[in-house]
C-alpha cells in the first residue's frame, strides 16, 4: 500500500451476557506476545459464530480490549489476561476501542499495524468545515444567476 | 488466510514410530492456537492432541496418551506430532488445526468447531 494509512479511534463501553458457550471470541497479545509491534495490548483476533459477542454485534476482531469490568489490560502477560477474561463473571464490561482505517482505500477494521491512530474530531472538523464552504459557494454561485 | 501444510504420513509396521509436521503460513503464527485431528474410514473425526500458543499447555485424547507428543517451534512456524508405539487403531488421516488467538472462554480443545483452519491432511497406515 502506498502513502500513510491513518485511523479513527473511537471508544466504546460494551457490557456482554456470559452465554451458554461463554464470552465467545479469542484474543491475541500481552507483554510476552506482542501482536502489534511495541504495542503489549490485548487485541480480539476471533469472533465466533453465534457467540455472546457476535450476537451483541459490537465488539469486532481488530479491536482493542482497554479494560475488563474496570480491570486495566496494561502491561498483563498473555494468560493473565486470559484468566481475567474466564473470571470475569457472567456480566462482563468491556471498555474497548475501535480503529477504523480512513485512508488508502475502503474502510475496514484494522487488527495489525501502526497502533498510533487520529481522533474522530480531527477527520471531523474539517469535513464539516469543507461541506460549510461548499454550501456558501453553491448559494452564492445561485445568487448570481 | 492460514495455509496449513502436514506431511510425515506413511505406511509403518505396529510398533513403529512417525513424525508428522504441520507447517502454516502467517507471520503471527506465534499467536495460533493448535491441534491435530484424525479420521479413520467410515468414521468421525476425533480429536488426538493440542498445544497452545506458547507450547506450555498441551493436551491428549486418552487413546493416543503416553505414545503421542505434541509440540511447535515458533521460529520455524510448524507444529509437529511424534507418533510412537504406533498400533493398526492409529490407521487414519491426521489433519492439523489453527484458531488465531486463545479462546477467552473455557477451551473446548477437542471440539472441532472451535478451530478455523485446517490442512489437507496426511495418510498413516499401521499394519
Known amino acids: 500500500m502506498n502513502g500513510r494509512v491513518d485511523y479513527l479511534v473511537t471508544e466504546e463501553e460494551i457490557n456482554l451476557t456470559r452465554g451458554p458457550s461463554g464470552l465467545g471470541f479469542n484474543i491475541v497479545g500481552g507483554t510476552d506476545q506482542q501482536y502489534v509491534s511495541n504495542d503489549s495490548g490485548i487485541y480480539v483476533s476471533r469472533i465466533k459464530e453465534n457467540g455472546a459477542a457476535a450476537l451483541d454485534g459490537r465488539l469486532q476482531e481488530g479491536d482493542k480490549i482497554l479494560s475488563v469490568n474496570g480491570q486495566d489490560l496494561k502491561n498483563l502477560l498473555h494468560q493473565d489476561a486470559v484468566d481475567l477474561f474466564r473470571n470475569a463473571g457472567y456480566a462482563v464490561s468491556l471498555r474497548v476501542q475501535h480503529r477504523l482505517q480512513v485512508q488508502n482505500g475502503p474502510i475496514g477494521h484494522r487488527g495489525e499495524g501502526d497502533p498510533s491512530g487520529i481522533p474522530i474530531f480531527m477527520v471531523l472538523v474539517p469535513v464539516f468545515a469543507l461541506t460549510m464552504v461548499a454550501a456558501w459557494a453553491f448559494m452564492r454561485y445561485r445568487q448570481q444567476l | 488466510q492460514v495455509q496449513l501444510v502436514e506431511s510425515g504420513g506413511g505406511l509403518v509396521q505396529a510398533g513403529d514410530s512417525l513424525r508428522l509436521s504441520c507447517a502454516a503460513s502467517?507471520?503471527?503464527?506465534?499467536?495460533?492456537?493448535m491441534g491435530w485431528f484424525r479420521q479413520a474410514p467410515g468414521k468421525e473425526r476425533e480429536f488426538v492432541a493440542h498445544i497452545n500458543w506458547s507450547g506450555s499447555s498441551t493436551y491428549y485424547a486418552d487413546s493416543v496418551k503416553g505414545r503421542f507428543t505434541i509440540s511447535r517451534d515458533n521460529a520455524k512456524n510448524t507444529m509437529y506430532l511424534q507418533m510412537n508405539s504406533l498400533k493398526p487403531d492409529d490407521t487414519a488421516v491426521y489433519y492439523c488445526?489453527?484458531?488465531?488467538?486463545?479462546?477467552?472462554?473455557?477451551?473446548?480443545?477437542?471440539?472441532?468447531?472451535?478451530?478455523?483452519?485446517w490442512g489437507q491432511g496426511t495418510q498413516v497406515t499401521v499394519s
Open positions: 488445526a489453527v484458531t488465531i488467538g486463545s479462546p477467552v472462554d473455557s477451551y473446548r480443545h477437542s471440539d472441532p468447531l472451535e478451530y478455523d483452519y
Open positions: 502467517g507471520r503471527t503464527f506465534s499467536t495460533y492456537t
